[in-house]
Interface confidence: medium
C-alpha cells in the first residue's frame, strides 16, 4: 500500500500540539471534521470532531483536544494541550462526507512526546500570561461512529497512546493545562 506522508512533532510533556489542516474552502467549509489516532493494525479512532454542520471558528473541546474550523481560510486548527507521553502516536485530520468515506487531509502527524518540560519558552509551551480559558460551555460535538478501512494504508509503529476520553475536562489548576489563545476568529 502507498505510504502516506508524515509530519513529525517532537514535544515534551505538558506542552501543546498545535497544528493546521488545510482543506478546499468551498467544498468542505461546513462539512464535519475530525481528529483521529491510528493505532497499529486498527482502524482510525475518532478522538474529537467539529459540529455538524461545522460552525465557523467555534471552538469544540473534547478533553484535552480543541478543534477550531476557520471557514474563511479553509483551515482546521487542532490543539492537544498538556501532552502526556502516552499521547505519542500517529494522527490525522479527516472530513466526514457521508455516505462517502471520510476524506483524509494530508499530512499525517507523527507525535512524539517525551518526559521532562523544556526550559526555554516555545510555541508549544503554555504561559501564565495572556491566556484565554475556554469556558465550560464550549461545544462538545457528537462524532459519527464510522471510519474508513481504506484510510489505514500502513501499520504504524506500536503506540500506547490513549488520548483523553470524550467526557474528561481540562483541569485548570495547573499552568500547563491552560488553553492559550486564540479561540477567536
Amino acid at each position: 500500500a502507498t505510504k502516506l506522508t508524515e509530519e513529525k512533532y517532537e514535544l515534551k510533556e505538558g506542552q501543546t500540539l498545535d497544528v493546521k489542516c488545510d482543506y478546499t474552502l468551498e467544498k468542505f467549509a461546513s462539512s464535519q471534521k475530525a481528529w483521529q489516532i491510528i493505532r497499529d493494525g486498527e482502524m482510525p479512532k475518532t478522538l474529537a470532531c467539529t459540529e455538524r454542520p461545522s460552525k465557523n471558528s467555534h471552538p469544540v473541546q473534547v478533553g484535552r483536544i480543541i478543534l477550531e474550523d476557520y471557514h474563511d481560510h479553509g483551515l482546521l486548527r487542532v490543539r492537544m494541550v498538556n501532552l502526556q507521553v502516552e499521547d505519542s502516536g500517529l494522527y490525522q485530520c479527516v472530513i466526514y462526507q457521508p455516505p462517502k468515506e471520510p476524506h483524509m487531509l494530508f499530512d499525517r502527524i507523527r507525535l512524539v512526546v517525551t518526559k521532562g518540560f523544556s526550559g526555554t519558552p516555545g510555541s508549544n509551551e503554555n504561559s501564565t500570561q495572556n491566556v484565554y480559558k475556554i469556558p465550560p460551555t464550549t461545544t462538545k460535538a457528537l462524532c459519527p461512529l464510522y471510519t474508513s478501512p481504506r484510510t489505514v494504508t500502513q501499520a504504524p509503529p506500536k503506540s500506547t497512546a490513549d488520548v483523553s476520553t470524550p467526557d474528561s475536562e481540562i483541569n485548570l489548576t495547573n499552568v500547563t493545562d491552560i488553553i492559550r489563545v486564540p479561540v477567536f476568529n
Epitope: 476557520y70 483551515l75 486548527r77 510555541s123 477567536f184
Partner: antibody, heavy 117, light 107 residues
Framework: QVQLVQSGAEVKKPGSSVKVSCNPS????????ISWVRQAPGQGLEWMGG????????NYAQKFQGRVTITADESTSPGYLELSSLRSEDTAVYYC??????????WGQGTLVTVSS | DIQMTQSPSSVSASVGDRVTITCRAS??????LAWYQHKPGKAPKLLIY???SLQSGVPSRFSGSGSGTDFTLTISSLQPEDFATYYC?????????FGGGTKVEIK
C-alpha cells in the same frame, strides 16, 4: 463581500472618552471575533484588544488595560471600542477588524480620533 | 508579550525586483503569523495567513514561509501597486502583536 462600517471622525478633549462603532454589513458578528487596531501618526499598527461574541470575554493589550472596553454581542450589532482618559498620544486612526488565529481578513475603513485641547 | 522584529525597516527597489522581508518572533509562534500590506489612507490588507497560505484574491507573486520564530515574506517580482508598508503579526497568543513595519519604496 463582507464590509465593516465604522462611525465617523471624532475630536475629543484630553481626559474625555470616545466610543467608536463597527457595523458588519449584513447583520451581526455572529461567531466572528472583532479586534481593534490603531495607527498613530507616523507609527505602526498596534493591536488594542479583541472579543469573541460567542464568549463575550474581551482580551486587551496590557498598555490599554483599564482604559479600553470592547463590546460585541452574538445577536446584535454593531461592536464598540470605548477608550477613556484620552491623551494627545491617543490621536490615531482606529480600525475594527474581523479575524483571529488566521489573521484579519476584513477591516473597517478607519476612524480618525483627534485628541486636542 | 511576544515581540515581533521586522527587517529591514525600509527597502528601495525597482519594478520587477525580488523583495524579501523578514520577521522574527521573540518566542515560538508555530505557524500563526499573518502578513499585511498597508497603504496611506487605506485599511490594511491581509496577504498571507498561517505563515504561508495566500489569502484569496492576493496575487501569487506574494509568498510566505517559515515557522517557529523566523518568517519571510517574498514579493517575487515587484509591481507598481506593491509600493506600500508591510507588517507581520503574530496570532499565536494574546496580545496579538505587529512587527514595526517595512516600507517598500521606489528606487
Amino acid at each position: 463581500q463582507v464590509q465593516l462600517v465604522q462611525s465617523g471622525a471624532e475630536v475629543k478633549k484630553p481626559g474625555s472618552s470616545v466610543k467608536v462603532s463597527c457595523n458588519p454589513s449584513g447583520g451581526t458578528f455572529s461567531t466572528y471575533a472583532i479586534s481593534w487596531v490603531r495607527q498613530a501618526p507616523g507609527q505602526g499598527l498596534e493591536w488594542m484588544g479583541g472579543i469573541n461574541p460567542i464568549f463575550g470575554t474581551a482580551n486587551y493589550a496590557q498598555k490599554f488595560q483599564g482604559r479600553v472596553t470592547i463590546t460585541a454581542d452574538e445577536s446584535t450589532s454593531p461592536g464598540y471600542l470605548e477608550l477613556s482618559s484620552l491623551r494627545s498620544e491617543d490621536t490615531a486612526v482606529y480600525y475594527c477588524a474581523r479575524g483571529g488565529a488566521v489573521g484579519f481578513a476584513y477591516w473597517g475603513q478607519g476612524t480618525l480620533v483627534t485628541v486636542s485641547s | 508579550d511576544i515581540q515581533m522584529t521586522q527587517s529591514p525597516s525600509s527597502v528601495s527597489a525597482s519594478v520587477g525586483d525580488r523583495v524579501t522581508i523578514t520577521c522574527r518572533a521573540s518566542q515560538g509562534i508555530s505557524s500563526w503569523l499573518a502578513w499585511y500590506q498597508h497603504k496611506p489612507g487605506k485599511a490594511p490588507k491581509l496577504l498571507i495567513y498561517a505563515a504561508s497560505s495566500l489569502q484569496s484574491g492576493v496575487p501569487s507573486r506574494f509568498s510566505g514561509s517559515g515557522s517557529g520564530t523566523d518568517f519571510t515574506l517574498t514579493i517575487s517580482s515587484l509591481q507598481p501597486e506593491d509600493f506600500a508598508t508591510y507588517y507581520c503579526q503574530q496570532a499565536n497568543s494574546f496580545p496579538f502583536t505587529f512587527g514595526g513595519g517595512t516600507k517598500v519604496e521606489i528606487k
